[in-house]
Amino acid sequence: ECVTQLLKDTCFEGGDITTVFTPSAKYCQVVCTYHPRCLLFTFTAESPSEDPTRWFTCVLKDSVTETLPRVNRTAAISGYSFKQCSHQISACNKDIYVDLDMKGINYNSSVAKSAQECQERCTDDVHCHFFTYATRQFPSLEHRNICLLKHTQTGTPTRITKLDKVVSGFSLKSCALSNLCHMNIFQHLAFSDVDVARVLTPDAFVCRTICTYHPNCLFFTFYTNVWKIESQRNVCLLKTSESGTPSSSTPQENTISGYSLLTCHSIPVFCHSSFYHDTDFLGEELDIVAAKSHEACQKLCTNAVRCQFFTYTPAQASCNEGKGKCYLKLSSNGSPTKILHGRGGISGYTLRLCKMDNECTTKIKPRIVGGTASVRGEWPWQVTLHTTSPTQRHLCGGSIIGNQWILTAAHCFYGVESPKILRVYSGILNQSEIKEDTSFFGVQEIIIHDQYKMAESGYDIALLKLETTVNYTDSQRPICLPSKGDRNVIYTDCWVTGWGYRKLRDKIQNTLQKAKIPLVTNEECQKRYRGHKITHKMICAGYREGGKDACKGDSGGPLSCKHNEVWHLVGITSWGEGCAQRERPGVYTNVVEYVDWILEKTQAVEQKLISEEDLGGEQKLISEEDLHHHHHH
């Protein structure tokens, strides 16, 4: 059961795994989610009634029953891990914490003009986990404008104290904003340097993902299952060095080495979806259940929140109605305690963490008036929204922004009485693919902006909550929402897509069309539409000479812009005068202006859900963006 709300003045009793320090309850919840065993947590906020040495403690907890007794305690904030939830979460934390000193090993100090510059330095330094910046109002002359880069064994502060006129924050490496990526995998090569941890993994790719999410792993060496020393087979050595790169490497048969991908614009999702045949994973047994197949066993593991990995033993002929045994397992670190080969088992990992899709990493793969046909998988966030009344037809475009959410235009729902008549098809290139038996997503709820009246006056935005969740694949996955911190970005690579008309009097296209269209300034756009008010909540795109534009049927679809190799949903196709007319740009809903609205609507407002202001002990945040791209916390 997914419980997103935080419980104020509540403490969970018992079940302690470990205590870390976090600047907020929200971040404590993220730390809990990424911890292999944490299901619940109790955070202690700053409070006069509480011993200052306990301020900002985040106690990570586990429970066989998935719950613990609740006790009333002032300043305590408790909650549950997002492991139980189906929405995306991310380790990315762009919040800046005012008047908090996050303690760690200060390994670098330098002068910086601003906290943002300090955070950028931290993000671009391989060792940095978090930073503290003394503002120019800081009492100590020598400390003013000093940026202290810090790291710890756990990646979280060793202590957090109140300190006036400083600000602290975390590295944004997990936001896919660093520029230090090495994606190469080196066969038959072993790296030297310092081992920070040793885990067992079935292959080098799992080893790399574990390295990526380990706070101090910069590179790794994996010993395959045919490595000469039996006791070292399947060993994944997580490594670091002072320089941040391997100081030396040795050619070694049956070893594979590589780097953490944390500093990449495409951080892997924190899960391992492959099956490992003729492989048994050992660990603490959680349960043994009958299952028809290894796929069914993986589902059972995924649905059992404490299960981390499994081994499936296929049925012996005619035994147990053809069902095999599914061993659900766990360990202290989320990895098997031993990996055995040649016993006939099929093993794998829980998929519960696959939804922890990392910071927006939607990439381009190696309808539209004046457009050209798209290829399959080119616009995996694009959906076609159909109405079944009076007959089934394409109604509008839309964009996947989360695994239960489609963002589209409000004007699409004129005359739509009920979500029951709507169908969302994803992963579609040609409308002709849609047959009676084609799978679709039903719509549970249509959320139209309450200030929407008509497309031309703005607020032309709507959310569709799907009845079931979208499993992300290469052909259907989300697009990033633009970051509020990127308001000043000048997008130069923008595309409008859809199955809409290719000219004003036309019909819906079969193949998804695409057209590259330049953005137009709002001043320029206003000149072209003297009879309308072009607000900052609108964004315009089009060629002065016309010729390429969105048109009828493209409405609600995306204006997608690529920035730093990441696609952002910059606009929602809204309105325009004719189609592709000279000096009549298309007008789109300016998505960045609705990020807060999207966050508010996609987060279920449940009882006892507490805001930052309610938390006496939560720090005042200055947030570069409260919505971390398409993740709904």
């Epitope: 000193d101 200060n106 100090s109 002068v111 009492p139 100590s140 002359l141 020598e142 400390h143 404008n145 000093i146 202290l148 104290t161 300190l163």
Partner: antibody
Framework: QVQLVESGGGVVQPGRSLRLSCAAS????????MHWVRQAPGKGLEWVAI?????????YYADSVKGRFTISRDNSRDMLYLQMNSLRAEDTAVYYC?????????????WGQGTLVTVSS | DIQMTQSPSSLSASVGDRVTITCRAS??????LNWYQQKPGKAPKLLIY???SLQSGVPSRFSGSGSGTDFTLTISSLQPEDFATYYC??????????FGQGTRLEIK
Amino acid sequence: QVQLVESGGGVVQPGRSLRLSCAASGFTFSSYNMHWVRQAPGKGLEWVAIFLSYDGSNKYYADSVKGRFTISRDNSRDMLYLQMNSLRAEDTAVYYCAKSEILVVPTLDYWGQGTLVTVSS
Amino acid sequence: DIQMTQSPSSLSASVGDRVTITCRASQSISSYLNWYQQKPGKAPKLLIYAASSLQSGVPSRFSGSGSGTDFTLTISSLQPEDFATYYCQQSYSTPPITFGQGTRLEIK
């Protein structure tokens, strides 16, 4: 290794001037804040002045020397100076130059051996 | 300016003794406190920074604690070379940097 060597001390009459020098080696001089600290005979330590590394205009002084002493540095020669004018008897002290390092908080992590200034008629 | 007050001004102790020197700031200085040791005719030497962190090369018998306004320097087992004068110094609200008046530790 870090070394700081002061020179220029001596006996001087009240009202006269003296210039102290501090030669630095073993570290990137231009990157560090530098201080002068003094100690009157048989007394405690008293901070005198600081020259910040990252801003040429950032020189600060103790109230007791403000307007009379001037701190300066020559990064090309790894030298720190203290120009002392209008000297008074109460300026008699051993003068130390010290390197500052931010070890979580600002500290005076290396000191010279000191140079004695005696102001006497 | 922040005033720093050390106590005692002087104390006598024997080799092997545990010794504690305290330092009080006239207002909160967080953990912006350093301790120095000075032997006669020598320059001061940094012992402890940020109230409790041991400077590299300093023996582990030296330790510091405290936060806010009250701080202590502890020598767990006095050695002959520890007889010296000890100064606390705040670097929280500067300029000026201010020192305590010193504590002279003598052999009993």
